[in-house]
């Protein structure tokens, strides 16, 4: 009689991520007695996947009943598969012996390759905001996904960015790879409703890449212009000037009033108006009373914005001529200031 | 007291590179940008570029196109501006500034670097 | 970018006299103007930022005016020791630029 052989008819067997992995094995002859294992790998450090005389695999079955004399099919499925059970798997007969059992024959393995989906990418940007005109980086992650090939893209409010470097590890043989990009994203000053796309295409993922984003609201920071100037008067000896403090961003906002370098009013911004472009408008007014000075008065609008040394505007108010002389004007002389509050 | 203190004068042969340093003192280094600004011998002043090292964001004047790296050194406080295939215009004093884009102009000036280029 | 188009190239004036460097901007820069004082050897010395804002410890005798593309310099009464070049510089839009110069002599 022809001696046994152990037959595995896939060389490879490709399966996603958490489906059922079915590994073939039979044998042409019953003899000799003895049972069928299961390894992941050869030689001496490999695994044991399944074995029919003993043990506890909880996530192994059979293809078929392995306790009836005639069976010649050990067949094996592995459930929930992960990367992690990437690699060649061998079926092997054992013949009976005392006390042990003996090696037999080895089929030739079958290869098991595990396809799994990336991670949702995951893109940050700098840790400190920037401003409009400054090239920043962005980087994008994403993790666990087999095979190797993956494509990654970035994107700027759907315009395609060509700035960018990408790496994928480990670059030799591995279970399961990572993919690490840098992004560099000119800022403007109209990018506060901008968002930085991170797309990443697979082969698992049918044709439906993941994304992941940033919005530019949580790095740029889009310094205000200032601009001082007198009202027409209120009354007989009132003078009411005005600070418009033009397209900022985020919102946080101090405003101080000087009257001749001193502090007269402090106040955060609250009801600012918002523009198209996601950047912020406000206003600050001050009512001078200018029977209560002799001298002309310096009036200075300082502002300090999201944490950055304070900038400030000044405006000479002349108390010789009448108030109602001075009417608007609407050109502010922006006269020498020292408010300077550096950190 | 704000300083910036600059490395000191180099002599390069066209084609080559230099990297000028700039080490900073007396301030939160991550909190303003360091902005390069050159001279040429008897000439008026030229923006190279800057970068804030609180964000890593660069802008660089593109007349260089390409030629000018900059970096910064949180841990020693240092920004530093390579030129590189260098040619003998590039011959000038190289300067290091303080600013806080968009608030303030340049408010604090390093030394000067001179970099002669000349085979 | 931005032409920074300053005048006059230099000029002579007297001790105590007022004088007066203009800069014209080829397209708007709100209020960002900057002018800078340099003596030779040395490194430029901020003076004006904001168009009219006086930086710390400069005397009062330096003032800037202006907005939109057309800014003035001023010095009310010449000193001896404001004999150097002065420079206007934008920095509303990168890169940022400097005027050609102003070269101050006494006469």
């Known amino acids: 009689e022809e001696e046994l052989q152990v037959i595995q008819p896939d060389k490879s067997v490709l399966v996603a991520a958490g489906e059922t992995a079915t590994l073939r094995c039979t044998a042409t002859s019953l003899i000799p007695v003895g049972p069928i294992q299961w390894f992941r790998g050869a030689g001496p450090g490999r695994e044991l996947i399944y074995n029919q005389k003993e043990g506890h695999f909880p996530r192994v079955t059979t293809v078929s009943d392995l306790t009836k004399r005639n069976n010649m099919d050990f067949s094996i499925r592995i459930g929930n598969i992960t990367p992690a059970d990437a690699g060649t798997y061998y079926c092997v007969k054992f013949r009976k012996g005392s006390p042990d059992d003996v090696e037999f024959k080895s089929g030739a393995g079958t290869e098991l390759s595990v396809r799994a989906k990336p991670s949702a990418p995951v893109v940050s940007g700098p840790a400190a905001r920037a401003t409009p005109q400054h090239t920043v980086s962005f980087t994008c992650e994403s993790h666990g996904f087999s095979p190797r090939d993956i494509t990654l893209k970035w994107f700027k409010n759907g315009n395609e960015l060509s700035d960018f470097q990408t790496n994928v590890d480990p670059v030799g043989e591995s279970v399961s790879y990572s993919i690490h990009s840098t992004a560099k994203v000119v800022l403007t000053r109209e990018d506060v409703h901008s968002q930085v796309i991170c797309e990443v295409a697979h082969v698992t993922l049918q044709g439906d890449p993941l994304r992941g984003t940033a919005n530019l609201s949580e790095t740029i920071r889009v310094p205000p212009t200032l601009e001082v100037t007198q009202q027409p008067v209120r009354a007989e000896n009132q003078v009411n000037v005005t600070c418009q403090v033009r397209k900022f961003y985020p919102q946080r906002l101090q405003l101080t009033w000087l009257e001749n370098g001193n502090v007269s009013r402090t106040e955060t911004a609250s009801t600012v108006t918002e523009n198209k472009d996601g950047t912020y408008n406000w206003m600050s007014w001050l009512l001078v009373n200018v029977s209560a000075h002799r001298d002309d008065v310096k009036l200075t609008c300082q502002v300090e914005h999201d944490g950055q040394p304070a900038v400030s505007k000044s405006h000479d108010l002349k108390v010789s001529a009448h108030p109602k002389e001075q009417g608007s004007n609407t050109a502010a002389e922006n006269t020498g200031s020292n408010e300077r509050n550096i950190y | 007291q704000v300083q910036l203190v600059q490395s000191g004068a180099e002599v390069k042969k066209p084609g080559s590179s230099v990297k000028v340093s700039c080490k900073a003192s007396?301030?939160?280094?991550?909190?303003?940008?360091i902005h390069w600004v050159r001279q040429a011998p008897g000439q008026g002043l030229e923006w190279m570029g800057d970068?804030?090292?609180?964000?890593?964001?660069?802008a660089n004047n593109q007349k260089f196109k390409g030629r000018v790296t900059i970096t910064a050194d949180e841990s020693t406080s240092t920004a530093y501006m390579e030129l590189s295939s260098l040619r003998s215009e590039d011959t000038a004093v190289y300067y290091c500034?303080?600013?806080?884009?968009?608030?303030?102009?340049?408010?604090?000036w390093g030394q000067g670097t001179l970099v002669t280029v000349s085979s | 970018d931005i032409q920074m188009t300053q005048s006059p190239s230099s000029l002579s004036a007297s001790v105590g006299d007022r004088v007066t460097i203009t800069c014209k901007a080829s397209?708007?820069?709100?209020?960002?103007v900057a002018w800078y004082q340099q003596k030779p050897g040395k490194a430029p010395k901020l003076l004006i930022y904001?168009?009219?804002s006086l930086e710390t410890g400069v005397p009062s005798r330096f003032s800037g005016s202006g907005s939109g593309t057309d800014f003035t310099f001023t010095i009310s009464s010449l000193q001896p020791e404001d004999i150097a070049t002065y420079y206007c510089?934008?920095?509303?839009?990168?890169?940022?630029?400097f005027g050609g110069g102003t070269k101050v002599e006494i006469k």
């Open positions: 007396g301030y939160t280094f991550t909190d303003y940008e």
């Open positions: 904001g168009t009219a």
């Open positions: 500034a303080r600013a806080v884009s968009g608030y303030y102009a340049m408010d604090y």
């Open positions: 397209e708007d820069i709100y209020d960002r």
């Open positions: 510089q934008q920095y509303w839009t990168t890169p940022w630029t």
């Open positions: 970068i804030h090292p609180g964000s890593g964001g660069t």
